[in-house]
Interface confidence: low
């Protein structure tokens, strides 16, 4: 009956991180079983930058320093599972940790933007302020993101200008609007890696006014933009 | 062989923009890993991280100066370039470029000298 | 910000010493600290990574310790031409920053 080394459920394992993930974060976990039953001790080698330590017990893999991406990715370290006790045999996987830039949220609208309104007839070009924002975290920058108009189509009677990072202005290009709703299609791009895009809609209101407001049927509340 | 060269004006005055050019030979930044940082040591004084750039144009400024710097790259030409707005004569120095990889700036330009001036 | 302060602004040894400079950080930097060497003429070269690996081409009389705050570099048999300014540089977290230099003169 030959003493057999602990195997490993996989060759390599693979986990994804982001650069910014916090010290002391788990980013992975290895297993191996022992033929003969024994228990396991597992422990990395080939750490060259010092990045990781391994619950000698539970494979569970953290960090231990910042994650530096420009260092290039993945990083590669050997984990080694050795029995305790009995011939103290050992075996080794690869453990892949892939640095990322995590950014899955597109960009959406701040608020709520409906009721925009303009007093009909536009006495001059007219433009409101809106804002973006996303669900991802921005530790070592702020959201950059750039603002165009939806489609070509719109570009007859619409421009956007981007003011900083998370808000841009709207401006009509004319004063030539009918006494209606326009539903204005905006694309919203993060510039994240890889880049994501969001298609928000700005429905604004041409309407007669009374004192500064829009007259509209009861129910319906809008709120003022200067123009 | 890897080198780096930084380039300035020398001489400039109060109020104006500092450009400042590093020129390197023997990697390119557009490799996996590469980027390039300016740092600057007034006269008699340490050193001072200023702005990082890295191989695919993402950029690390340091916040106390963030609002006055911009610094840029031209892959093609094996160039980076920095931008600093509003100079004082608090921004006399010495200018370095140097290549970062692996969290390391192991290797440096001679630096270029700026003097502020009125 | 990580403050690095290096308390020894300058130090003189005779040739032949041992010669130990010391840098520590405001706040523990996991062991992520390079040290430069500055030569009167403004040349900067890395030295150490890391806190203890040698960059390659630099001699092996060079050598770095430490851990959590306190870190030193250390020259164990003096050349004349290690006479320079050594810098300490934390990379745990932006901005990057370096500690005030310890300039290294031959008594």
């Known amino acids: 009956d030959v003493n057999e080394a602990p195997q490993f459920s996989q060759h390599v394992f693979q986990a994804k991180v982001s650069e910014d993930v916090a010290i002391g974060t788990k980013v992975g976990n290895v297993t191996a079983k022992d033929p003969e039953g024994l228990d396991i001790s597992y422990s990395l080698r080939g750490d060259t930058r010092g990045w990781l330590k391994i619950d000698h017990v539970t494979g569970e893999i953290f960090s231990v320093a910042p994650l530096d991406r420009e260092a290039g990715s993945p990083y590669r370290v050997q984990v080694v599972a050795t029995e305790v006790g009995g011939s103290s045999l050992s075996s080794v996987s690869e453990f892949h940790l892939i640095l990322m830039d995590v950014n899955d949220n597109p960009p959406r609208l701040a608020k709520d933007y409906t009721g925009l309104f303009f007093c009909h007839p536009l006495s001059a070009p007219g433009s409101l302020i809106f804002e973006a924002t996303d669900d991802d975290q921005h530790l070592f920058r702020g959201p950059h993101f750039t603002f165009s108009l939806g489609s070509g189509s719109l570009q007859n009677d619409w421009e956007v200008s981007k003011i900083n990072g998370t808000h841009a202005r709207l401006s009509t290009r004319h004063t030539e609007f009918e006494e209606r709703e326009y539903v204005v299609l905006i694309r919203i791009n993060d510039g994240g890696r890889p880049p994501l895009e969001g298609i928000v809609s700005l429905p604004v209101t041409f309407c007669s006014c009374v004192e500064g407001s829009c007259f509209r049927p009861a129910g319906h509340k809008h709120h003022h933009h200067h123009h | 062989q890897v080198t780096l060269k930084e380039s300035g004006p020398g001489i400039l005055q109060p109020s104006q923009t500092l450009s400042l050019t590093c020129s390197f030979s023997g990697f390119s930044l557009s490799t996996s890993g590469m980027g390039v940082s300016w740092i600057r040591q007034p006269s008699g004084k340490g050193l001072e991280w200023l702005a990082h750039?890295?191989?695919?144009?993402?950029?690390r400024y340091n916040p106390s100066l963030k609002s006055r710097l911009t610094i840029s790259k031209d892959t093609s030409r094996n160039q980076v370039f920095l931008k600093i707005t509003s100079v004082d004569t608090a921004d006399s120095a010495t200018y370095y470029c140097?290549?970062?990889?692996?969290?390391?700036?192991?290797?440096w330009g001679a630096g270029t000298s700026v003097t502020v001036s009125s | 910000d990580i403050q690095m302060t290096q308390t020894t602004s300058s130090l003189s040894a005779s040739l032949g010493d041992r010669v130990t400079i010391s840098c520590s950080a405001s706040q523990g930097i996991n062991n992520y600290l390079n040290w430069y060497q500055q030569k009167p003429d403004g040349t900067v070269k890395l030295l150490i990574y890391?806190?203890?690996s040698l960059h390659s081409g630099v001699p092996s009389r060079f050598s770095g310790s430490g851990s959590g705050t306190d870190f030193s570099l250390t020259i164990s048999n003096l050349e004349p031409e290690d006479i320079a300014t050594y810098y300490c540089q934390q990379y745990s977290k932006l901005p990057l920053t370096f500690g005030g230099g310890t300039k290294l003169e031959i008594k």
């Open positions: 750039i890295f191989w695919d144009d993402d950029k």
């Open positions: 140097a290549r970062r990889v692996l969290s390391t700036f192991d290797v």
């Open positions: 890391y806190t203890s």
